[in-house]
Interface confidence: medium
């Protein structure tokens, strides 16, 4: 995850009384919630591995970096971080590994400076389409988010709703066009089988896109054309068999792009010829000399860059009467 780590050395710890105790008084400016460590100098609050079941109500107004990792939050309701006065300076929020399975509409409302959000390693069975946009308007107020880290948020098979997990995540990314300013999106390790075709076109500011360690088989219907500022595209450890001409041309047309393609089961048959030719000429693929064939069996572990057209044949398709099992 790319969430910030504090360099604070002067943390003060609060007394370990119940985390759910809510003071009727407005919190003192230098108050530190129970079970948390606070450093006003570093503008950082850490409530880490404390089995909290809800977000502390008495967070200090100075907080810029908030770590709520390793807890048992289960649900983030609407306005989970709404405070009076608001947490106007909160810029980085890390909720990774906190057993969240539901994030409701408007969970991150009233955080005007929130630039970095990490929800990784939570089994998000129910991510509201309006989790990030806050409202169901067709065009919402722009979110200040610049980095959204959603690695390994796929719930176990038996906890999934009867709907596409990919579709649920994409609906949240696209709702109200609120994330037009998003520059980094990490979606690694989510068992994605496909990427809905409209998602990238609506995130025009993306610089970094991480789709590594998914189960993507093809990019045929995915368009990268609008992502003119994309710097890195991580597609390692997927199920990609070949990249076709349209995709190759789009990637080559992106002026800053670096693509990472390691550990995909490339199928080295006649359909691979265009990709091999492209790989030999392009500079956009990082570590291209490490790409090897997985199929067919006779080609296994052959280096793609060392192949020529004679190596890339397709076995003739036999008429049904001649096929044997």
């Amino acid at each position: 995850s790319s969430s910030p780590t504090s360099s604070a050395s002067s943390f003060s710890s609060s007394a370990p009384f119940l985390a759910s105790a809510v003071s009727a008084q407005p919190p003192l400016p230098d108050q530190c919630p129970a079970l948390c460590e606070c450093s006003e100098a570093a503008r950082t609050v850490k409530c880490v591995n404390r089995n909290l079941t809800e977000v502390p109500t008495d967070l200090p107004a100075y907080v810029r970096n908030l770590f709520l990792t390793g807890n048992q939050l289960a649900v983030l309701p609407a306005g989970a971080f709404a405070r009076r006065p608001p947490l106007a300076e909160l810029a980085a929020l890390n909720l990774s590994g906190s057993r969240l399975d539901e994030v409701r509409a408007g969970a991150f409302e009233h955080l005007p400076s929130l630039r970095q959000l990490d929800l990784s390693h939570n089994p998000l069975a129910d991510l509201s389409p309006f989790a990030f946009s806050g409202s169901n308007a067709s065009v919402s107020a722009p979110s200040p988010l610049v980095e959204l880290i959603l690695n390994h948020i796929v719930p176990p098979e038996d906890e999934r709703q009867n709907r596409s997990f990919e579709g649920m995540v994409v609906a949240a990314l696209l709702a109200g066009r609120a994330l037009q300013g998003l520059r980094r999106l990490e979606l690694a390790s989510n068992h994605f089988l496909y990427l809905p075709r409209d998602v990238l076109a609506q995130l025009p500011s993306l610089r970094h896109l991480d789709l590594s360690n998914n189960s993507l088989v093809s990019l045929t219907y995915v368009s990268f054309r609008n992502l003119t500022h994309l710097e890195s595209l991580h597609l390692e450890d997927n199920a990609l068999k070949v990249l076709h001409n349209g995709t190759l041309a789009e990637l080559q047309g992106l002026p800053h792009i670096r693509v990472f393609l390691d550990n995909n089961p490339w199928v080295c048959d006649c359909h691979m010829a265009d990709m091999v030719t492209w790989l030999k000429e392009t500079e956009v693929v990082q570590g291209k000399d490490r790409l090897t064939c997985a199929y067919p069996e006779k080609m296994r572990n052959r280096v793609l860059l060392e192949l020529n057209s004679a190596d890339l044949d397709c076995d003739p398709i036999l008429p049904p009467s001649l096929q044997t099992s």
Epitope: S205, H229, E231, S232
Partner: antibody, heavy 116, light 107 residues
């Protein structure tokens, strides 16, 4: 919070080499390019090159080609810039910065003085 | 290499003035341009990216415009803390190139 902390000032003789380090913290080091920019006293900013910490790939401005080397040690989240065959006109403040397009976070700068 | 020409190289202005700095690219760079502010003895600070997007935390009196080869940084009402040197940077092509800088001084 994101921080880039550079090594201390250096005084070198003409013809020598200098190696400046840049230690990153507060983010995942391998996900952003590190660039190097220099600034002679009272002068403007001069882009020297980039290094991708994940792959180790680099690109240098023509002016420094053959004389500069940008490397990294990912185990300690540190980038390095080595400039060889120093001459007096290399006296400058050398900055590392995060980001391959427009840099967003900068190191505090390392003053390199080349003097006989 | 793409040349970035900034004008003027320096200017004198008073608090409250509207200030405009121009950056011209030797070839089209779409909107791949950023503006930085640098005060003496300090590191550069990014103000604007993608020609017109305001960096979070930067006062709204700063704005950027332009596309292709002509770009402008405008400070709507100059404040005492705005006296500094301003640089443009193109990131459309390698090598990246900065403008030579515009020094904004107190009149």
């Amino acid at each position: 919070q994101v921080q880039l902390v550079q090594s201390g000032a250096e005084v070198k003789k003409p013809g020598a080499s200098v190696k400046v380090s840049c230690k990153a913290s507060g983010y995942t080091f391998t996900t952003y390019d590190i660039i190097w920019v220099r600034q002679a006293t009272g002068q403007g900013l001069e882009w020297m090159g980039w290094m991708n910490p994940k792959s180790g790939n680099t690109g240098y401005a023509q002016k420094f080609q053959g004389r500069v080397s940008m490397t990294r040690n990912t185990s300690i989240n540190t980038a390095y810039m080595e400039l060889s065959t120093l001459r007096s006109e290399d006296t400058a403040l050398y900055y590392c910065a995060r980001g391959g397009l427009e840099p967003d976070y900068w190191g505090q700068g390392t003053l390199v003085t080349v003097s006989s | 290499d793409i040349q970035m020409t900034q004008s003027p190289s320096s200017l004198s202005a008073s608090v409250g003035d509207r200030v405009t700095i121009t950056c011209r690219a030797s070839q089209g760079i779409r909107n791949d341009l950023a503006w930085f502010q640098q005060k003496p003895g300090k590191t550069p600070k990014r103000l604007i990216y993608d020609a017109s997007n305001l960096q979070s935390g930067v006062p709204s009196r700063f704005s950027g415009s332009g596309s292709g080869t002509e770009f402008t940084l405008t400070i709507r009402s100059l404040q005492p803390e705005d006296f500094a040197t301003y640089y443009c940077l193109q990131y459309n092509r390698y090598p990246r190139t900065f403008g030579q800088g515009t020094k904004v001084e107190i009149k």
